[in-house]
Interface confidence: medium
């Protein structure tokens, strides 16, 4: 059954990065609008994005309540201009989304190198901790707060004058690496959740930062912080 002249949504897809989570679907509406509902496996349905002509709905506020829960969403289709009609006993057509568990499935956003400092033949590289919309006790949590030891960072570094890359790993947000004196190095980092088996186990690489440029200059005397 379905409401006259409305078609059910299809291709429901979760798009989620660092827990910012949007449900997308098709088709672009012609003479119809949509309402989205979201629920946990054992919870009640909660309606969002009432009678929207968009084909996406930001569900972040709901999923951040518990990122380890498994969520299901559904999209209802209504005829445009008749959404308040009470005469019809027909249930509007709807489509269910795939299940979505944010902790397991949210993509890792592109990380940023916050700073690096050189002391002699060692360089300390710090990765900026990304803030999420996940809260605990009214405080927003960082990616590290949420994932803890499940999250590591991989550092790629190479001499500016060559292309041979080296790697280092950390389960904090800091690297301490050995470098050759008098050489400039370039750095890029990647966030990784090694125990994910799927394509979303790694972020894209951060922008490359090189010594001797704006974010850092190679100094062999004393500490030199580069923040922005």
């Amino acid at each position: 059954s379905g409401t006259t002249n409305t078609v059910a949504a299809y291709n429901l897809t979760w798009k989620s990065t660092n827990f910012k989570t949007i449900l997308e679907w098709e088709p672009k509406p012609i003479n119809q609008v949509y309402t989205v509902q979201i629920s946990t496996k054992s919870g009640d349905w909660k309606s969002k994005c009432f009678y929207t002509a968009d084909t996406e709905c930001d569900l972040t506020d709901e999923i951040v309540k518990d990122v380890k829960q498994t969520y299901l969403a559904r999209v209802f289709s209504y005829p445009a201009g008749h959404v308040e009609s009470t005469g019809s006993t027909e249930e509007p057509p709807y489509e269910n989304s795939p299940e979505f568990t944010p902790y397991l499935e949210t993509n890792l956003g592109q990380p940023t190198i916050q700073s690096f400092e050189q002391v002699g033949t060692k360089v300390n590289v710090t990765v900026q901790d990304e803030w999420t919309l996940v809260r605990r006790n009214d405080t927003f949590l960082s990616l590290r707060d949420v994932f803890g030891k499940d999250l590591i960072y991989t550092l790629y570094y190479w001499k500016s004058s060559s292309s041979g890359k080296k790697t280092a790993k950390t389960n904090t947000n800091e690297f301490l690496i050995d470098v050759d004196k008098g050489e400039n190095y370039c750095f890029s980092v990647q966030a990784v959740i090694p125990s994910r088996r799927t394509a979303n186990r790694k972020s894209t690489d951060s922008p490359v930062e090189c010594m001797g440029h704006e974010k850092g200059e190679s100094r062999e005397t004393g500490h030199h912080h580069h923040h922005h």
Epitope: D66, T70, L104, I152, S195
Partner: antibody, heavy 118, light 107 residues
């Protein structure tokens, strides 16, 4: 296929030490924390601690901090647990277990029975 | 440490019965609960994680539910091969702790 192959049964005297091994295969050894769990009839299952094979960093249950030492050998994809100053209360089956994303133990070794007896 | 109180300790059931095991945490563990099955002479096997998610390859007669401090594990239609001890475990706060186990026996 993921496999955790543990060393065989041990019969040791009180006061002695022993080292149990757990050889991992079928997955990236450095990508998952390795945990150790004690099973005894009296106390059911007790978590001993875990080690990050990538860094060698370990976390212990306070109860076992003086009893167990966790190490890894990346070259052989093997995790080890050393138990010292053994007493009859340490008689149990000891399991290694791979921690999955978010906390649960998805794969377990077959267990190493340890008997402490004079 | 968070204490996990699991009940009952023993269950004697017939094939085809519905079975429910409960686990109560001494403080909220959100949905950080896993359930394991240990058959005689074998290692524990993960069945349920995040309180309600079935692990890979686990039959759908095994289900989990609950949030906070009270959790339930259900076998909808017990089969002879379900003879085992079942454990709950909280993976919310270290040290990870287990329930005392429920021994399921088939009449």
């Amino acid at each position: 296929e993921v496999q955790l192959q543990q060393s065989g049964p041990e019969l040791v005297k009180p006061g002695a030490s022993l080292k149990i091994s757990c050889k991992a295969s079928g997955y990236s050894f450095t990508g998952y924390y390795m945990n150790w769990v004690k099973q005894s009839p009296e106390k059911s299952l007790e978590w001993i601690g875990e080690i990050n094979p990538s860094t060698g960093g370990s976390t212990y249950n306070q109860k076992f901090k003086a009893k167990a030492t966790l190490t890894v050998d990346q070259s052989s994809n093997t995790a080890y647990m050393q138990l010292k100053s053994l007493t009859s209360e340490d008689s149990a089956v000891y399991y290694c277990a791979r921690r999955e994303l978010g906390g649960p133990f998805g794969y377990w070794g077959q267990g190493t029975p340890v008997t402490v007896s004079a | 440490s968070i204490v996990m109180t699991q009940t009952p300790k023993f269950l004697l059931v017939s094939s085809g019965d519905r079975v429910t095991i409960t686990c109560k945490a001494s403080q909220s563990v959100s949905n950080g609960i896993a359930w394991y099955q240990q058959k005689p002479g074998q290692s524990p096997k993960l069945l349920i994680y995040f309180a309600s998610n079935r692990y890979t390859g686990v039959p759908d007669r095994f289900t989990g539910s609950g949030y906070g401090t009270d959790f339930t594990f259900t076998i909808s239609t017990v089969q002879a091969e379900d003879l085992a001890v079942y454990f709950c475990q909280q993976d919310y706060s270290s040290p990870w702790t287990f329930g005392g186990g429920t021994k399921l026996e088939i009449k």
